[in-house]
């Protein structure tokens, strides 16, 4: 789902207040609900009728450093006999998410939000079009 | 997918540098790749064999203020005839994501990262268990 543009008032101080110096804000250390965990059904990526594989991307200057991307294995979907049914389509489910980018020059460290597009998994759909028109 | 714990060195300055004052960091204004957009297939939530509905949650002190959560519609999956197949299971696909929480007292505004669990959509799986065990 979409993250709206940030050019609005979210990161601004109220108009009656002095502006933020140097175009930066105060980010408190620590993460709220840090212990909250995804605990999905077991092995859904291989048991799905639209199975997918995971690829891990790693960047030490990003938080989280590890971002996992899914790739659908098939164009069609897997039927009850374990065969590919090309009358159906496997499609990726995507999500916009925020990560934090670390920028440092010597002892001066700053952070910036970055929007990342993550493919979370795949689902099997009935096609809208059966061929390119 | 999981976001690791933040109690490591990501938000710390190098050991040879003076510590961050007051337990806060500098967050630059603006978002990298802000214009990046999800461009999923049309109406996959209703065309999926494991269809879902969306519910929008709104919080003016969170960025993004709007977080969309998916809810699977069925326990089973929808077959080619549009009937529910109870030999298969619809399951939610979840993702841990970061949002920014705004905290203000008068003109003093600070921000903190928050982890949120988002159900992004649903997929159809062959059951491991046919009912709750």
């Amino acid at each position: 789902r979409k993250i709206p543009k940030v050019g609005h008032t979210f990161f601004q101080k109220p108009e009656s207040c002095p502006p933020v110096p140097g175009g930066s804000m105060k980010l408190d250390i620590g993460i709220i609900n840090e212990n909250q965990r995804v605990s999905m059904s077991r092995n859904i990526e291989s048991r799905s009728t639209s199975p997918w594989n995971y690829t891990v991307t790693w960047d030490p200057n990003r938080y989280p450093s590890e971002v996992v991307q899914a790739q659908c294995r098939n164009l069609g979907c897997i039927n009850a006999q374990g065969k590919e049914d090309i009358s159906m389509n496997s499609v990726p489910i995507q999500q916009e998410t925020l990560v934090v980018r670390r920028k440092h020059q010597g002892c001066s460290v700053s952070f910036q939000l970055e929007k990342v597009l993550v493919t979370v998994g795949c689902t099997c759909v009935t096609p809208v079009i059966h061929h390119v028109q | 997918r999981k976001i690791p714990k933040v109690g490591h060195t990501f938000f710390q300055k190098p050991e040879s540098c003076p510590p961050v004052p007051g337990g806060s960091m500098k967050l630059d204004i603006g978002i990298i790749n802000e214009n990046q957009r999800v461009s999923m297939s049309r109406n996959i939530e209703s065309r999926s064999t494991s269809p879902w509905n969306y519910t929008v949650t709104w919080d003016p002190n969170r960025y993004p203020s709007e977080v969309v959560q998916a809810q699977c519609r069925n326990l089973g999956c929808i077959n080619a005839q549009g009937k529910e197949d109870i030999s298969m299971n619809s399951v939610p696909i979840q993702q841990e994501t970061l949002v920014v929480r705004r905290k203000h007292q008068g003109c003093s505004v600070s921000f903190q990262l928050e982890k949120v669990l988002v159900t992004v959509g649903c997929t159809c799986v062959t059951p491991v268990i046919h009912h709750v065990q």
């Epitope: 605990s39 999905m40 059904s41 077991r42 | 879902w52 509905n53 519910t55 949650t57 959560q69 998916a70 809810q71 699977c72 519609r73 069925n74 326990l75 089973g76 529910e84 299971n89 619809s90 399951v91 939610p92 669990l117 988002v118 159900t119 799986v125 059951p127 491991v128 268990i129 046919h130 009912h131 709750v132 065990q133």
Partner: nanobody, 123 residues
């Protein structure tokens, strides 16, 4: 944290009927399905019925099929279990709970349960 309050349990004669209710609060927005479970003395807790909040479709354990009906009221965040043709073997404490993974939910996925409601069927 999900709060669950079950009610409606009673002592009833074999062949009789009861309607159990479950009030739910603190559910995640994405909560998907609800279930009824029961635990007879000296036995494991077992699945009885399930319903999806959105689609309203239901599933039943073989032992209650055709006799029990599960329904829900989304506005009130309540689920119900209509129990007909009750048998002595239906005697148990009945519990409701969120089913975060629908029919894939396992008993060890649960952190907490309500206090349950006692159903006793006499012969």
């Amino acid at each position: 944290q999900v709060q669950l309050v079950e009610s409606g349990g009673d002592l009833v004669q074999a062949g009789g009927s009861l309607r159990l209710s479950c009030s739910v609060s603190g559910l995640r927005v994405s909560s998907y399905a609800m279930g009824w479970f029961r635990q007879a003395p000296g036995k494991e807790r077992e699945f009885v019925a399930a319903i999806s909040w959105v689609g309203g479709d239901t599933r039943y354990a073989d032992s209650v099929k055709g006799r029990f009906t599960m329904s829900r009221d989304n506005a009130k965040k309540q689920v119900y279990l209509e129990m007909n043709s009750l048998k002595p073997e239906d005697t148990a404490v009945y519990y409701c709970n969120d089913m975060p993974y629908g029919m894939e939910t396992r008993m060890d996925d649960y952190a907490s349960w309500g206090q349950g409601t006692q159903v006793t069927v006499s012969s």
